[in-house]
């Protein structure tokens, strides 16, 4: 047998319950135990009795099912209702039953504002039991309350799926005013009227609000909270605030500063990041967008040419990325580039101007007059053809590229040549005999290769066969010549 | 001082029935639930269920429903346990343990345990 | 149902160590676990209930601490009777479920 001295005579605590905002609820508590899983409840009550109103935190008994036992009803202790304290302070308050032993399976919870209180910082339980009843006392503290901490608190009890629920205890704590909408800063049109909105609450109530224009009062009579200040229109930056008054004391929102919108500031830092012939990618620094977005921004491009008009190619852009491809520009030429943007109120001033340049282009012209014909005892293809006429743009002919194709019974294989740019001819070996020879002439650049030339076609015969004839760059309009031998 | 004291070791065949008895004094025996453990050999505690002693409603863990009756003799201050249809599984000591003060559910008396040994 | 994951499920250690098994609950239990010393062929004893009050007669060298889901039992400087199986309790719902137990053993 196992013995001990009883224990009855001290207090016992019980589930320090539950850490003030941890709100959610447990739904597999006892609290909530469905009459599943074999758990047949041990006592069972009826809502209502006779002759007495149901007051909501009464368990009034009916006789068990084990027999002709009657179990007294239950009911909490009536206890403050009501507690106002100051912030931070700490508060402690209880709620108390006393339960005959014959109830012999109970549980005790915090709930606030219908949550239960989960965890076990703040609340604990004692017994006082004696033979026939146990006198159980539920305290719940706070240290250093706050706002969160508002609302109504109650015990409850489970005595199987019975719930007996204490008074509420309403919790009121009270501070100097608390925002709860503040002032935002604002970018306004010159002379355009805009709103301010601030609130602030308690407890205690009322609040009273006064509105602050760079330091000064704007309303001589306080407002109550929630206030909005209409302002007429401003013609320079502005800082408002809003003080917020109770019988605590006031509070000051933050200070908000009110821009005035105006045109942006130029673009800085105009930079060039690739040129080819015809294009130059260039990126800017914005400037600063005047309190409000930038819309789209405009690059701007001169040529500086003496023999040029001076007209001014405007390309616009998107404001971001702070990017711009200029396109269309004229081979080995020089520009002058500048970056305006605008906003809603309008554009900024041009970017300092810089210079940029383009590349040397390819030549736009092919080689003229190309002739082709073989010489058998060399057994080589002679081509000929004369100078392009090259723009100056084009840069400096550097020299040629010569595409000669054979083709013989379904294969076709392509060769080239480069030739310096003093030539304006070459000689080249016969590949395949009893094939045909495809040949075109592009004119090569610093800038890159021209176009070529219109295919010129030679017939090379078997060994021992002998022509002289050329095949030459055909007249607009007639088809490729093919000398056949 | 509280005390349960259990009844001695049983030896039965598989099929037959056993009823164990969990006797408490010092104390009021209507106002404590009386809880049911049992222990396989080697092995853990394993919740039964418990018996309210002023209602006489039981309540069985599941696993431990049909063969398994907790009843009262509130005269003599006892609690009953008794298992029927035995099987070579249900070999094991069976503890009562009273129910701690109101509104908890632990255990805080033991009574010493009884072996039942179910074996052919 | 609650389950109770107690560990470690066995441990070796010297008389005057510092000794901590723990149990975890797979659901919020708030405070509702009890510590029971059980030793070969002997009924449990009890030694903490509601997570961390010592019953009478229990030595102080046995603690008991945590809420909601974690809860652990510290036994500082142990001594030659404090051999044994060590089981927690779960008992805030139905059913009521004990932790597998951790056997404290002699190094």
């Known amino acids: 047998a196992i013995t001990e001295a009883r224990e009855e005579a001290k207090p016992y605590p019980l589930f320090p319950g539950p850490l003030p905002g941890s709100l959610q609820t447990d739904h597999t508590s006892l609290l909530s135990l469905p009459h599943t899983s074999g758990y047949q409840p041990a006592l069972m009550f009826s809502p209502t009795q006779p002759g007495r109103p149901y007051t909501g935190n009464v368990a009034i008994p009916r006789v068990t099912s084990a027999g002709s036992k009657l179990l007294p009803p239950l009911a909490f202790k009536h206890t403050v209702g009501h507690i106002i304290l100051s912030e931070h302070k700490d508060v402690k308050f209880n709620c108390s039953i006393s339960v005959p032993n014959i109830y012999q399976d109970t549980t005790i919870s915090w709930w606030k504002d219908g949550k239960e209180l989960l965890g076990a910082h703040h609340a604990i339980t004692q017994f006082y039991p004696d033979d026939e009843v146990t006198a159980i006392i539920a305290s719940f503290s706070i240290t250093s309350v706050q706002r969160s901490d508002n609302g109504s608190y109650i015990c409850k009890m489970k005595i199987n799926n019975e719930e007996i629920v204490s008074d509420p205890i309403y919790i009121e704590v009270q501070g100097l005013p608390h925002f709860t909408k503040q002032p935002e800063s604002m970018n306004v049109t010159r002379n355009t009227a805009f709103n301010l909105t601030c609130q602030a609450v308690g407890p205690p109530e009322p609040v009273n609000i006064f509105w602050v224009q760079n330091s000064s009062r704007v309303n001589e009579q306080p407002e109550k909270s929630p206030s909005v200040l209409t302002v007429p229109g401003l013609t320079e930056m502005a800082v408002f605030s809003c003080e917020a008054h109770n019988d605590k004391g006031l509070t000051v929102s933050k200070g908000v500063q009110i821009n005035i919108k105006a045109i942006p500031s130029p673009p800085t830092e105009v930079s060039i990041h690739n040129s080819t012939a015809h294009s130059i990618l260039i990126s800017w620094v914005p400037g600063f967008d005047g309190y409000s977005p930038f819309r789209n921004c405009s690059v701007q491009v001169k040529e500086v040419d003496p023999l040029s008009n001076g007209s001014v190619m405007i390309f616009n852009t998107s404001a971001s990325p702070h990017m711009y491809q200029i396109k269309q520009l004229q081979a080995l030429a020089n520009y002058s580039i500048g970056v305006s943007c605008m906003n809603e109120i309008g554009w900024s001033a041009v970017s300092p101007w810089i210079l940029a340049s383009t590349t040397e282009g390819a030549p736009s012209v092919a080689p003229l007059n190309v002739t082709v014909f073989l010489n058998e005892s060399r057994d080589n293809v002679d081509i000929r053809w004369m100078k392009p006429l090259t723009k100056r743009q084009a840069g400096e002919l550097v020299g040629y590229r010569i595409s000669h194709v054979w083709q013989s019974a379904g294969i076709s294989k392509e060769l080239l040549e480069e030739v310096g740019q003093n030539n304006s001819r070459a000689q080249i070996s016969v590949q395949v005999h009893n094939a045909t020879c495809t040949v075109r002439i592009a004119a090569v650049t610093k800038g890159g290769v021209g176009p070529f030339s219109d295919p010129v076609k030679i017939f090379i015969p078997a060994h021992g066969w002998v022509d002289h004839a050329p095949s030459s760059t055909p007249a607009p309009g007639n088809a490729d010549p093919v000398l056949i031998i | 001082q509280v005390q349960l004291v259990q009844s001695g070791s049983e030896l039965k065949k598989p099929g037959a029935s056993v009823k164990v008895s969990c006797k408490a004094s010092g104390y009021t025996f209507t106002n404590h639930g009386m809880n049911w453990v049992r222990q396989a050999p080697g092995q853990g505690l394993e919740w039964m269920g418990w018996?309210?002693?002023?209602?006489?409603?039981?309540t069985y863990a599941q696993g431990f429903t049909g063969r398994f009756v907790f009843s009262l003799d509130t005269s003599v201050s006892t609690a009953y346990l008794q298992i029927s249809s035995l099987k070579a599984e249900d070999t094991a000591v069976y503890y009562c343990?009273?129910?701690?003060?109101?509104?908890?559910?632990?255990?805080?008396?033991w009574g010493q345990g009884t072996l039942v040994t179910v074996s052919s | 149902d609650i389950q109770m994951t107690q560990s470690p499920s066995s441990l070796s250690a010297s008389v005057g160590d510092r000794v901590t098994i723990t149990c975890k609950a797979s659901q919020n239990v708030r405070t509702a676990v009890a510590w029971y010393q059980q030793k070969p062929g002997k009924a449990p004893k009890r030694l903490i209930y509601l997570a961390s009050n010592r019953h009478t007669g229990v030595p102080s060298r046995f603690s008991g601490s945590g809420s909601g889901t974690e809860f652990t039992l510290t036994i500082s400087n142990l001594q030659p009777e404090d051999f044994a199986t060590y089981y927690c309790?779960?008992?805030?719902?139905?059913?009521?479920?004990f932790g597998g137990g951790t056997k404290v053993e002699i190094k």
């Open positions: 343990a009273r129910k701690g003060v109101t509104a908890a559910r632990y255990f805080d008396y």
């Open positions: 309790l779960q008992h805030w719902n139905y059913p009521l479920t």
């Open positions: 018996i309210n002693t002023y209602t006489g409603e039981p």
